[in-house]
């Protein structure tokens, strides 16, 4: 769930890395209330995920490795 490009809450689903093309990180500030990882999916959706959850960290790590290889 997001509003004005801010994540307001986290998804309650687990996504597969095959579904994700990239991510951006949201840091809590005066505009956005929470830290979040915003996953960008192959369907053009943006999904707000909790950066503390293991499955989120795993995908971020996997995508970061891919980016570093390029």
């Amino acid at each position: 769930a997001s509003n004005f490009d801010c994540c307001l809450r986290y998804t309650d689903r687990i996504l597969h890395p095959k579904f994700i093309v990239g991510f951006t990180q949201q840091l809590a500030n005066e505009t956005c209330d929470i830290n979040a990882v915003i996953f960008h999916t192959k369907k053009g959706l943006s999904v707000c995920a909790n950066p503390k959850q293991t499955w989120v960290k795993l995908i971020v790590r996997r995508l970061s490795k891919k980016i570093n290889k390029m």
Partner: antibody, heavy 120, light 107 residues
């Protein structure tokens, strides 16, 4: 070797709750998810939900939301699945299964199953 | 939720036959699909992960193919121990829905 050992069969009355345990051994417990899947008589496999033992994160199938609770005890490498407000349709074999994100999020090892019978 | 539809729901075949089971997803699941075998009274067993990869210890007569919405499990030469029920499963996004199963029986 990897082993998932589940608790024994249960008979419950409608409206009661049941708590099934699944004790893991032979691998690093917190490195893999644990799923719960059930199979009712004459029916197919039904995914109920998953717990990540490393952070206790859970996500449940909508059908079971509010009735199922999955918990973990890392000190004993055991996962628990509690299902409340039981009805006759909950009569099934309940399986725990290790979720391995290294093999495409597949369930690569399964417990032996626990038969839960709901009957008045 | 993503729906998974298997066909046929049951199938009679003989030892040595080549058998194909299909699984269709209600939307593109990008190869995030696994296949399991279940025999009566036993726990399910992983056969294929990631649509095409053979799980450890699974005989090479089993193979998986497909992409997008359509996937196939093939047994190249049926053995007596292969008579069982087979399930596909979506793992793209929770809930991880299963197909309704295909029961493979001896002709």
């Amino acid at each position: 070797q990897v082993q998932l050992v589940q608790s024994g069969a249960e008979v419950k009355k409608p409206g009661a709750s049941v708590k099934v345990s699944c004790k893991a051994s032979g691998y690093t417990f917190t490195n893999y998810w644990m799923h719960w899947v059930r199979q009712a008589p004459g029916q197919g496999l039904e995914w109920m939900g998953v717990i990540d033992p490393s952070d206790s994160y859970t996500t449940y199938a909508q059908k079971f939301q509010g009735r199922v609770t999955m918990t973990v005890d890392t000190s004993t490498s055991t996962v628990y699945m509690e299902l409340s407000s039981l009805r006759s349709e909950d009569t099934a074999v309940y399986y725990c299964a290790r979720g391995n994100y290294g093999v495409d999020y597949a369930m690569d090892y399964w417990g032996q199953g626990t038969l839960v019978t709901v009957s008045s | 939720d993503i729906q998974m539809t298997q066909s046929p729901s049951s199938l009679s075949a003989s030892v040595g036959d080549r058998v194909t089971i299909t699984c269709g997803a209600s939307e593109n699941i990008y190869g995030a699909l696994n296949w399991y075998q279940r025999k009566p009274g036993k726990a399910p067993k992983l056969l294929i992960y990631g649509a095409t990869n053979l799980a450890d210890g699974v005989p090479s007569r089993f193979s998986g193919s497909g992409s997008g919405r359509d996937y196939t499990l093939t047994i190249s030469s049926l053995q007596p121990e292969d008579f069982a029920t087979y399930y596909c499963q979506n793992v793209l996004i929770t809930p991880y829905t299963f197909g309704q199963g295909t029961k493979l029986e001896i002709k």
